[in-house]
């Protein structure tokens, strides 16, 4: 027999069926030109000493073979003795070490068996009623196809599925969508209505994330506020990576879960922009303000569940950085200025009302004054910090106020509003005899003492009504009692107490008269 022809003789080997799992498989035969045909197959197992024979039985019942040696591909013409217009049954017999292994057979009409291409190029993936929809352009001149898919997860082997017949310029397939695991899909096509014809190769992997992106399991820590008024947010625990099927472990697009950080600055609500979204890799610096931080996971199907944390405000206060002068026209604050053209946000809130929204004011960009200070003024009519109570004041600064991550804390302090001089006056001043020449003076704490860092000291004044001599005694802001010594019996005294702040002298309390009784000896 000539090598170019199918040989109508008994094959040159004895048949001893090996029954082994290895051997020839995946035989496919198709037309490659107007008169040319090709069959190819895979061989599984050791290839040394293996001879392959392509077997063919015609519709007439006559059978022949092509000897291909070690090759697993054969090209032949329509003159090779194989009928190309009628149905033929083909299979491969591989002979080695006196054993024969047979491939599954294919039955087809060679002339009609065109080599179909798998879906090529961009396969669009979308979600439709809880299922996966894949769509692609039909390869040129190949309208009319049967389509199959196979899919696997990281822990399962391939499962085969059917997309049904396709007869249009675009083809599509509905496939199962997994809720919580990634999947790898591949598609293949063959000519519609020719069951025996060969399938195309499998397409490139289509990597599909789970319907639900994984819950982001991350932990944050916030560093101390630095001298620049900023603190770094750091990621202590990275989100767990999604387990991927084998074909999706390289840089396969489509299966990625992206994590984004959504930052919401709760302090200073009057600023232009309160929320910013940035990639998780780009951990920001924050001011000392309070923030809500959310980590949002999303994949090609959209956002998934998020995890939210509250980052409390940094409560570290600087008692001396802020100067407040109260005049007849109103109040002005002074503080060490930042760079040129800085916008400041001044926020205040009554102490004890931290749950409610703070009041704030945004200054126009300002440069430092000649003394290097920045200022903010308000009139009495505005009512700002007008009530006689303790306010927590925070000042934030930014050269780019619309960029949420560029704000920094300038200072955080307390201020007693309204007429602090009068409101801070100590009440319930009482005098008790202490010894023959001394008394103990007590008073109720000043309202100013509720305001951390505001009360600088108490001053107790004692006046001798006979001589009009006055003595003043400074008392620590934490004390509400003092002992006055070296007093004379029988002399009338008046005592008064006032509470001073760093920038304001308090008003004296009502004078309290007392005297030490003269001791009459027996």
């Amino acid at each position: 027999c000539r090598t170019s022809e199918c040989c109508f003789q008994d094959p040159p080997y004895s048949d001893a069926d090996s029954g082994s799992a290895s051997g020839p498989r995946d035989l496919s035969c198709y037309r490659i030109s107007s008169a040319g045909y090709e069959c190819s197959w895979q061989y599984e197992g050791p290839t040394a000493g293996v001879s392959h024979f392509l077997r063919c039985c015609l519709s007439s019942g006559r059978c022949c073979y092509f000897a291909t040696g070690s090759a697993t591909r054969l090209q032949f013409s329509d003159q090779a003795g194989v009928s190309v217009l009628h149905t033929v049954t083909l299979w491969v017999e591989s002979w080695a070490r006196n054993r024969t292994e047979k491939s599954p057979e294919v039955t087809l009409q060679l002339y009609k068996s065109v080599k179909y291409k798998p879906p090529l190029g961009d396969i669009k993936v979308s979600k439709l009623a809880g299922q996966l929809r894949m769509e692609w352009e039909t390869p040129d001149n190949q309208v009319g196809a049967e389509v199959q898919f196979r899919h696997r997860t990281p822990s399962s082997s391939w499962k085969l599925g059917d997309c049904g017949p396709q007869d249009d310029d675009t083809e599509s397939c509905l496939c199962p969508l997994e809720m919580n695991v990634a999947q790898e899909f591949q598609l293949r096509r063959r000519r519609l209505g020719s069951q025996g014809s060969s399938w195309s190769k499998w397409s490139s992997p289509v990597c599909v994330p789970p319907e639900n992106p994984p819950q982001p399991q991350v932990r944050f820590s916030v560093e101390q506020l630095g001298r620049d008024g900023r603190r770094r947010l750091t990621l202590k625990e990275q989100p767990t990576q999604l387990e991927l099927p084998e074909g999706c472990q390289g840089p396969a697009p489509g299966v990625e879960v992206t994590y984004q950080l959504q930052l919401h600055m709760l302090s200073c609500p009057c600023k232009a922009k309160a929320t910013r979204t940035l990639p998780l890799e780009k951990m920001p610096y924050l001011s000392g303000a309070a923030y809500n931080v959310a980590v949002i996971s999303s994949n090609r199907f959209g956002p998934g569940p998020n995890q939210t944390w509250h980052i409390p405000a940094d409560t570290h206060t600087e008692p001396v950085a802020l100067n407040i002068s109260v005049g007849t026209n109103g109040t002005t604050m002074y503080w060490p200025a930042r760079a040129q053209s800085t916008t400041y946000c001044i926020e205040w809130q009554p102490v004890g009302q931290e749950g409610s929204l703070a009041t704030c004011n945004l200054t126009a960009p300002q440069d430092p004054d000649p003394a290097g200070m920045a200022t903010y003024s308000w009139s009495r009519e505005s009512g700002a910090m007008g009530q006689e109570k303790c306010y927590h004041i925070t000042i934030f600064a930014s050269a780019h106020p619309k960029k949420l991550t560029l704000w920094s804390t300038v200072l955080s302090t307390y201020h007693f509003g309204g007429n602090a001089s009068a409101a801070g006056t100590p009440h319930h001043v009482s005098v008790k005899n202490h010894s023959l020449d001394s008394v103990s003076v007590d008073w109720a704490p000043s309202l100013l003492s509720t305001c951390p860092g505001v009360l600088k000291e108490y001053v107790v004044r004692c006046r001798d009504e006979d001589s009009n001599q006055v003595s003043e005694h400074p008392v620590q802001p934490t004390e509400t009692q003092v002992t006055l010594s070296d007093l004379r019996a029988g002399v009338a005294y008046t005592v008064q107490v006032r509470a001073d702040t760093a920038w304001l002298r308090g008003a004296w309390s009502q004078p309290q008269r007392f005297s030490i009784k003269v001791q009459v000896s027996d």
């Epitope: 094959p11 019942g61 006559r62 059978c63 149905t87 049954t89 047979k102 039955t107 025996g196």
Partner: nanobody, 124 residues
Framework: QVQLVESGGGLVQAGGSLRLSCLAS???????MGWFRQAPGKEREFVAA????????WYADSVKGRFAISRDNAKNTVNLQMNSLKREDTAVYYC??????????????????WGQGTQVTVSS
Amino acid sequence: QVQLVESGGGLVQAGGSLRLSCLASGRTSNYFMGWFRQAPGKEREFVAAISRSGGGTWYADSVKGRFAISRDNAKNTVNLQMNSLKREDTAVYYCAADRRTGTSVYTVDEYDYWGQGTQVTVSS
């Protein structure tokens, strides 16, 4: 060693139908299978054959369109559905297994294993 047992033969009127079945004792999914028949005083002749997967089928011209061969590899059976039976279909029908598939599917000598046969009689 494969053993084949035919069943389903019998007496039937012309124009009627019969279904022959062949049960194999061994694994025959790797063999081409065929049905042959032998009328009294005549040589054994080819009726139909089927490839290993069932994708390829072959028939003698005299039975084309009337007989249908099928197989169920899971059950190790091969069936021959015979419709529109004629008097000349009367014969002993044999099931055969071709382990090797040589030069044709219809040559008696190609087949390695044979059953004992089942009688089909078509009366007028």
